[in-house]
């Protein structure tokens, strides 16, 4: 039993960020005369939250009217709670002293815990594109949550991934926390339409996790396959050669025709066709005037895709010269070769 007791009935209070916290405190006596003050923390570094005697505390309101006679309820409300407000709050009775007020009795303290939602997860992929069969890393970050317990999962097209590492910082006590996770994903040729999803579950989200996504279309590069073919003769002394550029992504592609190593024509892929898997096909053709050539012609289709080193495919046209009066045609023979 004591002359005056300061009673803080709540050992702990849990409040969602943005809400108002009510910290309860009553005294068993109004004597001796002196103000009630609220502090966060204990010891010399404690932070004054409210002083009945003086001061301006815009976020704090008293639950009851402290100017009312015989009022022994010194509970306060703190508005717009943020994770930075977490800590132990003490209701402290001071007595008038000479010359300064003297701490008389303290309550046992109320621990304020703040529940704060994690920020929307941000997923980022590699800086440079990668080709199928390569492993690429994706990172996921979310910040500002409390308490520390959190669950993070990775998915690719709805399938959960297992190859990832996650850290929650800081390790010790803090007002709020951040999560950082890195997942490894093996690319396939079919991944243009694929998505990588980072899913974060936290007590503040009430079973409705937050998701961040990354489209593998931003990450993958599918190199083209080339096929050069000779079309049937369309006119005397002319041969139509086509270069089929298949299954490439992204669309950025430049094609150059070379005749015996000399540039004949350069063009940029424009009217492409899109495949179901998101890759593109394109075809270019070259009309060769055989009569202009005395010897065999080596035709090369050279493709530079997405700034990568050029790939090429060649086709040999064998030129057989016959006297005109015999009216013979130029023969063309396909001896294709693939060069890089």
């Amino acid at each position: 039993e004591e002359e005056l007791q300061v009673i803080q009935p709540d050992k702990s209070v849990l409040v969602a960020a943005g809400e108002t916290a009510t910290l309860r405190c009553t005294a068993t006596s109004l004597i001796p005369v002196g103000p009630i003050q609220w502090f966060r923390g204990a010891g010399p570094g404690r932070e004054l939250i409210y002083n009945q005697k003086e001061g301006h505390f815009p976020r704090v309101t008293t639950v009851s009217d402290l100017t009312k006679r015989n009022n022994m309820d010194f509970s306060i409300r703190i508005g717009n709670i943020t994770p930075a407000d977490a800590g132990t709050y003490y209701c402290v009775k001071f007595r008038k002293g000479s010359p300064d007020d003297v701490e008389f009795k303290s309550g046992a303290g109320t621990e304020l815990s703040v529940r704060a939602k994690p920020s929307a997860p941000v997923v980022s992929g590699p800086a440079a594109r990668a080709t199928p069969q390569h492993t690429v890393s994706f990172t996921c970050e979310s910040h500002g949550f409390s308490p520390r317990d959190i669950t993070l999962k990775w998915f690719k097209n709805g399938n959960e991934l297992s190859d990832f590492q996650t850290n929650v910082d800081p390790v010790g006590e803090s007002v709020s926390y951040s999560i950082h996770s890195t997942a490894k994903v093996v690319l396939t040729r079919e991944d243009v339409h694929s998505q990588v999803i980072c899913e974060v579950a936290h007590v503040t989200l009430q079973g409705d996790p937050l998701r961040g996504t990354a489209n593998l279309s931003e990450t993958i590069r599918v190199p083209p396959t080339l096929e050069v073919t000779q079309q049937p003769v369309r006119a005397e002394n002319q041969v139509n050669v086509t270069c089929q550029v298949r299954k490439f992504y992204p669309q950025r592609l430049q094609l150059t025709w070379l005749e015996n190593g000399n540039v004949s024509r350069t063009e940029t892929a424009s009217t492409v066709t899109e495949n179901k898997d998101g890759t593109y096909n394109w075809m270019s053709w070259l009309l060769v005037n055989v009569s202009a050539h005395r010897d065999d012609v080596k035709l090369t289709c050279q493709v530079e895709h997405d700034g990568q080193p050029a790939v090429s495919k060649s086709h040999d046209l064998k030129v057989s010269a016959h006297p005109k009066e015999q009216g013979s045609n130029t023969a063309a023979e396909n001896t294709g070769s693939n060069e890089r």
Epitope: E3, V33, K53, L66, K68, R69, N71, K96
Partner: antibody
Framework: QVQLQESGPGLVKPSQTLSLTCTVS????????VNWIRQPPGKGLEWIGI???????DYNSALKSRVTISVDTSKNQVFLKLSSVTAADTAVYYC????????WGQGTTVTVSS | DIVLTQSPASLAVSPGQRATITCRAS??????????MHWYQQKPGQPPKPLIY???NLESGVPARFSGSGSRTDFTLTINPVEANDAANYYC?????????FGGGTKVEIK
């Protein structure tokens, strides 16, 4: 139940130090303060000072230079020392519990005389 | 120091009548919404007995015939109706400022 009992010499010579003891029961001296109050014969009450539960003290400024209040919590006793007494210090001396002065001892009479 | 002036110095009242004692402080004894003024009854050869605390609150065991009122500098103790054993000295006391002080007392006699 709560009780306070003053004790000490009934007669003190002028210029000497008056020493009184207040022995308490029914409450803890770490939880409650104890006041000393005196009443000269046929006159009103005068507050001398208080020792709080934490051992800190506050004194009447008129007597401050001569007064010391101390405590021995293990013996449940509070002590009053008043130095350089004169006939004007003749009074009934009371101890009373806490800032509220809700319980009083019966008082002890101290006469300052040679 | 806060000086407390009680009036009247003495008062004779018939049983069943009302007795009113006033206490005027030289400065306000109000702090934090409360008046730190208290009243005591003292009978000859006895220590003071608390009657009223914080201007208007009855101490436990004190009959409801006793009541207190007032704020800041002006306070009143009322006994209604007076009974024969109410004959005593009555003191007001403040503990709002150091040094704590008592009024000079009012002697109540029963006719």
């Amino acid at each position: 139940q709560v009780q306070l009992q003053e004790s000490g010499p009934g007669l003190v010579k002028p210029s000497q130090t008056l020493s009184l003891t207040c022995t308490v029961s029914g409450f803890s001296l770490t939880g409650y303060g104890v006041n000393w109050i005196r009443q000269p014969p046929g006159k009103g009450l005068e507050w001398i000072g208080i020792i709080w539960g934490d051992g800190s003290t506050d004194y009447n400024s008129a007597l401050k230079s001569r007064v010391t209040i101390s405590v021995d919590t293990s013996k449940n006793q509070v002590f009053l020392k008043l130095s350089s007494v004169t006939a004007a210090d003749t009074a009934v001396y009371y101890c009373a519990r806490a800032g509220k002065m809700d319980y009083w001892g019966q008082g002890t009479t101290v006469t300052v005389s040679s | 120091d806060i000086v407390l002036t009680q009036s009247p110095a003495s008062l004779a009242v018939s049983p069943g009548q009302r007795a009113t004692i006033t206490c005027r402080a030289s400065e306000s004894v109000d702090s934090y919404g409360n008046s730190f003024m208290h009243w005591y009854q003292q009978k000859p050869g006895q220590p003071p007995k608390p009657l009223i605390y914080l201007a208007s609150n009855l101490e436990s065991g004190v009959p409801a015939r006793f009541s207190g009122s007032g704020s800041r500098t002006d306070f009143t103790l009322t006994i209604n109706p007076v009974e024969a054993n109410d004959a005593a000295n009555y003191y007001c006391q403040q503990n709002n400022e150091y040094p704590w002080t008592f009024g000079g007392g009012t002697k109540v006699e029963i006719k």
